[in-house]
Interface confidence: low
C-alpha cells in the first residue's frame, strides 16, 4: 500500500465568548486538514481525535467518527472544531484576552490531531502536532496557514 498523507493546514476560525463572573474564556476553534489517498483503492477516514494545549495544559478535546471515504488518488479537505475552555488556574488570561488597549490578543496553542484510516480491514493512525496563533480577544476567520506559529523571530518589515 502507498501512503496516506495527512497535512494540518491550520486554524480556519476561532469564535470566542466570555463568562465575566467565572473569568473564563470559551474558544471554538475550527481547524482544517488535507488528507491525501495515494492508493489505487478507496480508504475510509474512520475517526479524527484532536486536542488543544495551552501552556502544556489540555484545554479542549474533540472526536469525530465515520467521517468520509476518500477515493483512489484523491484528496479531501476536512474541517473539525475543538471547543476549548481557558479557566481556573489560567483565569489570569481573561484579563489579557479582554484588554481593549491592544488590538490583537494572540495566544500560542498546540494543536494535536490523530487521523485513523481503514482499508481492507487494516487500520492506520497518523498524528500531527503544530503550534498556532489564535486571537482570544475577538472572533477571527483566518486565511489558511495564516495562523501558523514559527518559533523564529521574524525581522520587522
Amino acid at each position: 500500500p502507498r501512503s496516506i498523507d495527512v497535512k494540518y493546514i491550520g486554524v480556519k476560525s476561532a469564535y470566542v465568548s466570555y463568562d465575566v463572573q467565572k473569568r473564563t474564556i470559551y474558544l471554538n476553534i475550527t481547524n482544517t486538514l488535507n488528507i491525501t489517498n495515494n492508493n489505487y483503492y478507496s480508504v475510509e477516514v474512520e475517526n479524527i481525535t484532536a486536542q488543544v494545549q495551552f501552556s502544556k495544559t489540555v484545554i479542549g478535546k474533540a472526536r469525530l467518527n465515520n467521517i468520509t471515504i476518500i477515493g483512489p488518488l484523491d484528496m479531501k479537505q476536512i474541517d473539525y472544531t475543538v471547543p476549548t475552555v481557558i479557566a481556573e488556574e489560567m483565569s489570569y488570561m481573561y484579563d489579557f484576552c479582554t484588554l481593549i488597549s491592544i488590538k490583537v490578543h494572540n495566544i500560542v496553542l498546540m494543536m494535536q490531531v490523530t487521523v485513523t484510516t481503514t482499508y481492507f480491514g487494516h487500520s492506520e493512525q497518523i498524528s500531527q502536532e503544530r503550534y498556532q496563533y489564535v486571537d482570544c480577544g475577538r472572533n477571527t476567520t483566518y486565511q489558511l496557514g495564516q495562523s501558523e506559529y514559527l518559533n523564529v523571530l521574524q525581522p520587522q518589515q
Epitope: 465568548s17 466570555y18 463568562d19 465575566v20 463572573q21 467565572k22 484579563d95 479582554t98 481593549i100
Partner: antibody, heavy 118, light 112 residues
Framework: QVQLQQPGAELVKPGASVKLSCKAS????????MHWVKQRPGQGLEWIGN????????HYNQEFKDKATLTVDRSSNTAYMQLSSLTSEDSAVYYC???????????WGQGTAVTVSS | DIVMTQAAPSVPVTPGESVSISCRSS???????????LYWFLQRPGQSPQLLIY???NLASGVPDRFSGSGSGTVFTLRISRVETEDVGIYYC?????????FGSGTKLEIK
C-alpha cells in the same frame, strides 16, 4: 416573555428552615445566572449569592454562607434558596433576579416576604 | 469587599427639573476590558427593583432616555432630566466587578 415567579409570603417559626422557589419561564434557564437579594423592611438591598443553572456553580456573600443554600432543578426551570436556623433577623423580602454574563439583573421576581415568628 | 456609598439619603426635586444622584465606590470598578461594572436600579414603592443603567453608562431596555449614567472608576452619577412623578422611589447603585456584589444604601427621590 421572561418571568420569574415567586410565592408571595412564607410564615416560619424561629429555628426552622424555609425553601424559597423562583420559577423561570420565557428564556433558556441554563444560560443565565440566578441571583438572590435580601431586603429587610425599610432597608436597602443585600446580595446573598448566585448560581449558574448549567453546572450549579455558586458564589456566596460570606455573610450568608452559613444561612443560605442555593440549588436549581433544571427539569422544572426552578431556582431554590434554603434558609436555615431562622431568626427575626431573617424576616425580609427575598428577591430572585437573573443575569447574563455581561448584563446584570435585567429581570426580577416579585419577591417572597418571609416572616419569622412564633 | 467593595463598599458602595450613596451620601445623600434623599433628594427633593420639582417635576420637570433635572436631578443628579451620586454614588462612590471604595475601589475602581473599571475592568481591564474597558467596562466599568456599575449599575443603577430604581425601586418604586411596593415594587421589585428595576434595572436602569448597566456598565455605568448603558441604558437598559425600555428605560426612557431621560435617564443617563456617567462617572469615572470610583465616582458615579445618575442623571434624570425632566423628572416625572413616576420617577419617585429609591435609587440604588451596585458594583458587579467583584464578589460579593454590593449595593449602595439608596437615595430616595422625593417630589417637592
Amino acid at each position: 416573555q421572561v418571568q420569574l415567579q415567586q410565592p408571595g409570603a412564607e410564615l416560619v417559626k424561629p429555628g426552622a428552615s424555609v425553601k424559597l422557589s423562583c420559577k423561570a419561564s420565557g428564556y433558556t434557564f441554563t444560560t443565565f445566572w440566578m441571583h438572590w437579594v435580601k431586603q429587610r423592611p425599610g432597608q436597602g438591598l443585600e446580595w446573598i449569592g448566585n448560581i449558574d443553572p448549567s453546572d450549579s456553580e455558586t458564589h456566596y456573600n460570606q455573610e450568608f454562607k452559613d444561612k443560605a443554600t442555593l440549588t436549581v432543578d433544571r427539569s422544572s426551570n426552578t431556582a431554590y434558596m434554603q434558609l436555615s436556623s431562622l431568626t427575626s433577623e431573617d424576616s425580609a423580602v427575598y428577591y430572585c433576579a437573573r443575569s447574563s454574563n455581561w448584563d446584570n439583573f435585567d429581570y426580577w421576581g416579585q419577591g417572597t416576604a418571609v416572616t419569622v415568628s412564633s | 469587599d467593595i463598599v458602595m456609598t450613596q451620601a445623600a439619603p434623599s433628594v427633593p426635586v420639582t417635576p420637570g427639573e433635572s436631578v443628579s444622584i451620586s454614588c462612590r465606590s471604595s475601589q475602581s470598578l473599571l475592568h481591564v476590558n474597558g467596562h466599568t461594572y456599575l449599575y443603577w436600579f430604581l425601586q418604586r414603592p411596593g415594587q421589585s427593583p428595576q434595572l436602569l443603567i448597566y456598565r455605568m453608562s448603558n441604558l437598559a431596555s425600555g428605560v426612557p432616555d431621560r435617564f443617563s449614567g456617567s462617572g469615572s472608576g470610583t465616582v458615579f452619577t445618575l442623571r434624570i432630566s425632566r423628572v416625572e412623578t413616576e420617577d419617585v422611589g429609591i435609587y440604588y447603585c451596585m458594583q458587579h466587578l467583584q464578589y460579593p456584589f454590593t449595593f449602595g444604601s439608596g437615595t430616595k427621590l422625593e417630589i417637592k
